[in-house]
């Protein structure tokens, strides 16, 4: 449903838009000489923004620093200097502003303290930064305070001495619950998982760490793993990489019961120089990257079954640099099952790949209509779109932003890219998809910053330039037509676009500074689009769209992971407000099962271009190195297992004789003698 994009020409020009926006543009000049600015939103739909500006002068012996704190409660239209609430203290920017989960209204700022002090100092607010309480800590924090997702009064922090500290009353009082802690994370139900070093230090003991758990904020503990290299949480899975007995390799083990029982994941082991990485996880499954041996810069993506144990190879030669730890793996949140990432070809060129079925199949991104293939293409008529993401940004290419999608702006994906056989180092353009990545169109010429407002009702963009700017572009039809608005007569050096997370707001803040001979002055312009989208959207403004539709004639059209979804989406021609309370209207319907809805169970694989699972020849008649729940047991399988999250019903049910696979657990990861429980008495 899209034509070629146009800027200001033969587009449905919005009447009086300049007057409407001028009346809704608010400038705020920050009266300080700060070198850096950080901005945080406090709560959801509250309109509260905190801005921390810092100015640092490194002197010979000590460094002198000054912070200023500003607060807005109208989405950035006006700011008030509230530095006095934090006693004009210098705030450590490396800790950022620790904002509480959900709408708790909690904020913690960590202050800089003089060298000889007993501990650090924080400023705490629980009323959306209206007031702050100064609290001196009994330790020097190493990390930002971490809120429990379940209870924002519960905090944990690591100290510079590797102590694990916990507060049960939003940082008023603290208790050290364990020493020699390397890494700590909140789990579900206020559980804390952490690794401890036994002998020397976190670095020296890597691979010999112990994994501990406390379910009562440090009263009692349980050792749930030994010989740990690292651990991570993803969805409902707890992962640990564990050193092997016989060599320096390590393997992933998985638990779905907070570490009470573990299973060895059916993934390759990795050596000292390699790594595992959880790319994405949800309640159903996990995407796991396993690094290739050697400094190749790539590895393999595997997708898990519902237990997190059996893995299917999803994508080879997946780009993931060891040096900077960069991967382009992107979850397209505007459409279920869609992910985009990059692969590294034999010739070292980088290519974008997309999956629409949660990693089942990957393909190149379709060439945008009416686009020409660039110099990277061998065939000038056949090529694909390649997306710039984290890796391009890390390589300092002219890419100001990573791909953007929002769950409530269904189907919309915006990204920088080039059209050819591989990612190009030339200046990219901005492309948009309105169907979750199936089709693409050039949205804007050259690199831009962009953001989505009003659940997709407005897209805003600003050109990426070294020169001062004063123009903002916006589109009310998903990037087809663009209007330009001069938001100031005095151009600014642009530093960033800020809009409330969640893409429900109609306000956008343009941040930057003006520079004269000696001073740099921070300034923000907040533009409210409420008068552009004058009326609320009505029933007639929405149209039906079937996600994942590729063949309207096929009865399985739109079926992904066993069901299809019809959405009501805003018509491109409707200029109206979805509004803050907009809820995506979708109607799911279940699809009949086919072999595509099943993955191959342990000991089985799908030969190339086949749909049936066959027994792995190397496993016939062999005992398998596979550990389920840490004990020997028989595992019965018919070779198939439903893909995690698949909701298909009826149709094809892969029936075949049930095999009894004798499993031999070769991991001593949970040697009973190693298990212990302790009380913190």
């Amino acid at each position: 449903r899209r034509g070629a994009p146009a800027e200001d020409q033969d587009c449905g020009r919005l009447p009086d838009f300049i007057a409407k926006l001028t009346n809704n543009t608010h400038q705020h000049v920050f009266d300080d000489l700060s070198g850096s600015v950080s901005l945080s939103w406090v709560g959801d739909s509250t309109g509260v923004i905190l801005v921390l500006t810092t100015f640092q002068v490194p002197l010979v012996i000590v460094s002198f620093g000054q912070s200023k704190l500003y607060r807005s409660e109208d989405y950035g239209k006006n700011f008030k200097d509230i530095t006095n609430l934090i006693n004009n203290t210098f705030i450590r920017t490396e800790f950022g502003m620790a904002i509480g989960p959900e709408n708790s209204g909690k904020v913690i700022l960590t202050a800089e303290v003089s060298g000889g002090s007993r501990g650090g100092r924080v400023f705490r607010s629980s009323d959306f930064a209206k007031n702050f309480v100064q609290t001196d800590l009994p330790f020097h924090p190493l990390t930002q305070m971490m809120y429990s997702p379940q209870n924002s009064d519960y905090l944990l922090a690591l100290s510079t001495e590797n102590g694990l500290w916990v507060s049960k009353n939003f940082g008023e009082k603290w208790e050290e619950i364990h020493k020699a802690v390397c890494l700590a994370k909140w789990g579900p139900n206020n559980i804390i998982f952490f690794t401890t070093h036994v002998n020397g230090s976190c670095k020296a003991d890597l691979g010999a760490l112990e994994l501990w758990r406390t379910s009562d904020l440090g009263k009692t503990f349980k050792t749930i793993g030994v010989k740990i290299y690292s651990f991570g949480l993803g969805g409902r899975f707890l992962f640990a990489s564990v050193m092997a007995d016989k060599d320096t390799t390590r393997r992933i083990h998985v638990s779905t019961d907070q570490g009470d029982t573990w299973s060895m994941a059916q993934l390759p082991s990795v050596g000292q120089e390699q790594f595992y990485s959880i790319l994405a996880a949800n309640e159903d499954m996990v995407f796991m990257h396993v690094d290739e041996p050697g400094d190749t810069g790539f590895g393999t993506i595997f997708t898990s079954d519902d237990r997190g144990i059996v893995y299917s190879k999803s994508l080879d030669r997946h780009l993931y640099t060891t040096t900077g730890g960069e991967t382009d793996f992107t979850n397209v949140t505007s459409l279920r099952g869609v992910y985009i990432t990059s692969t590294l070809s034999e010739d070292n060129s980088i290519q974008s790949m997309i999956t629409f079925d949660q990693g089942g199949r990957w393909e190149h991104l379709r060439k945008p209509e009416n686009s020409k293939c660039d110099a990277t293409a061998k065939n000038k008529n056949e090529c694909s779109l390649h997306i710039h993401a984290s890796y391009s940004i890390s390589q300092k290419l002219n890419v100001p932003m990573a791909p953007l999608s929002e769950p409530n702006a269904v189907g919309i994906v915006i990204a920088h890219g080039s059209v050819g056989d591989a990612i190009s180092v030339m200046v990219p353009d901005v492309y948009i998809s309105d169907d979750g990545g199936y089709s693409w169109a050039k949205m804007l010429e050259g690199p831009h910053y962009y953001t989505i407002l009003d659940s997709g009702g407005i897209i805003v963009a600003i050109e990426h330039s070294n020169r001062p700017i004063n123009v903002i572009k916006f589109s009310t039809d998903e990037g087809q037509c663009w209007q330009s608005y001069v938001f100031t007569q005095e151009p600014i050096y642009f530093t960033g676009l800020a809009s409330e997370p969640g893409a429900r707001s109609m306000n956008i803040s343009i941040w930057g500074f003006t520079e004269s001979f000696i001073t740099r002055q921070w300034v923000s312009y907040t533009v409210d689009f409420k008068d552009i989208l004058e009326r609320n959207c009505e029933e007639d403004d929405y149209t039906t769209w079937l996600a994942h539709s590729t063949d309207p004639g096929d009865y399985k059209d739109g079926c992904i992971l066993g069901y299809k979804e019809q959405f009501l989406r805003l018509r491109k021609s409707s200029v109206c407000q979805n509004g803050r309370d907009y809820v995506v209207a979708k109607q799911p319907s279940v699809c009949p099962c086919s072999l595509e809805d099943f993955l191959c169970d342990f000991g089985y694989f799908r030969p190339e271009n086949a749909s049936e699972c066959v027994e792995q020849p190397e496993l016939k008649g062999h005992e398998l190195e596979f550990c389920l729940y840490g004990k020997e047991e028989h595992l019965t399988t018919n070779g198939y297992r439903k893909i995690p999250g698949d909701k298909c019903q009826g149709g094809m049910n892969p029936a075949r004789e049930v095999k009894d696979l004798k499993k031999k657990c070769t991991s001593n990861f949970l040697n009973p003698t190693k298990q212990n429980s302790k009380s913190n008495s």
Partner: antibody, heavy 124, light 107 residues
Framework: QVQLVQSGAEVKKPGASVKVSCKAS????????MHWVRQAPGQGLEWMGW????????RYAQKFQGRVTMTRDTSISTAYMELSRLRSDDTAVYYC?????????????????WGQGTTVTVSS | DIQMTQSPSSLSASVGDRVTITCRAS??????LNWYQQKPGKAPKLLIY???SLQSGVPSRFSGSGSGTDFTLTISSLQPEDFATYYC?????????FGGGTKVEIK
Amino acid sequence: QVQLVQSGAEVKKPGASVKVSCKASGYTFGAYYMHWVRQAPGQGLEWMGWINPNSGFTRYAQKFQGRVTMTRDTSISTAYMELSRLRSDDTAVYYCARGKRSSGWYEGYGMDVWGQGTTVTVSS
Amino acid sequence: DIQMTQSPSSLSASVGDRVTITCRASQSISSYLNWYQQKPGKAPKLLIYAASSLQSGVPSRFSGSGSGTDFTLTISSLQPEDFATYYCQQSDVSPITFGGGTKVEIK
């Protein structure tokens, strides 16, 4: 093959109601909108509204709001259009037409399969 | 409602002629314009959708162009079976509206 078969001609008195049926075959009924379009004798085409057979969701032209009701029975792949409080200027040929789909979009691409038409005559 | 104005309302042409029919929308409808052919006593038949895409089974002598507010249907070489009434229709904004029709007659 894909086809839409409509019910036979009707003669009605002013103030009465008429219900026209449209049976679909050769495709997945729920996967396409069903539009209703009418044509008065010697006149052009006039769109009345559509129904999404999958959800039952409807959209009517303002002119017919309150007088028209579009329904469907997915078990027999049939769509219905009922027009009440008939007047003499409702005399027309009534067509059902399948909305053409492009990818996932149900609207915007015209009507690619039409029924043969049902003549409704309103006369006292 | 969006008004669709077709011109001419009727035209006479000979077999082999190149025929052009225009359609103007009262406001921009992007490329959401479709063209139909209707013969007496028959249901309309979709020729062109999305301004310029040829419906499958329709001869290639039919073509469409335009976007925004001005659109054109062209028959490159008129054939005897092409004598009929042609309608444009916008499907961008509800309610869907049709043009008044252009009757192509034999000269």
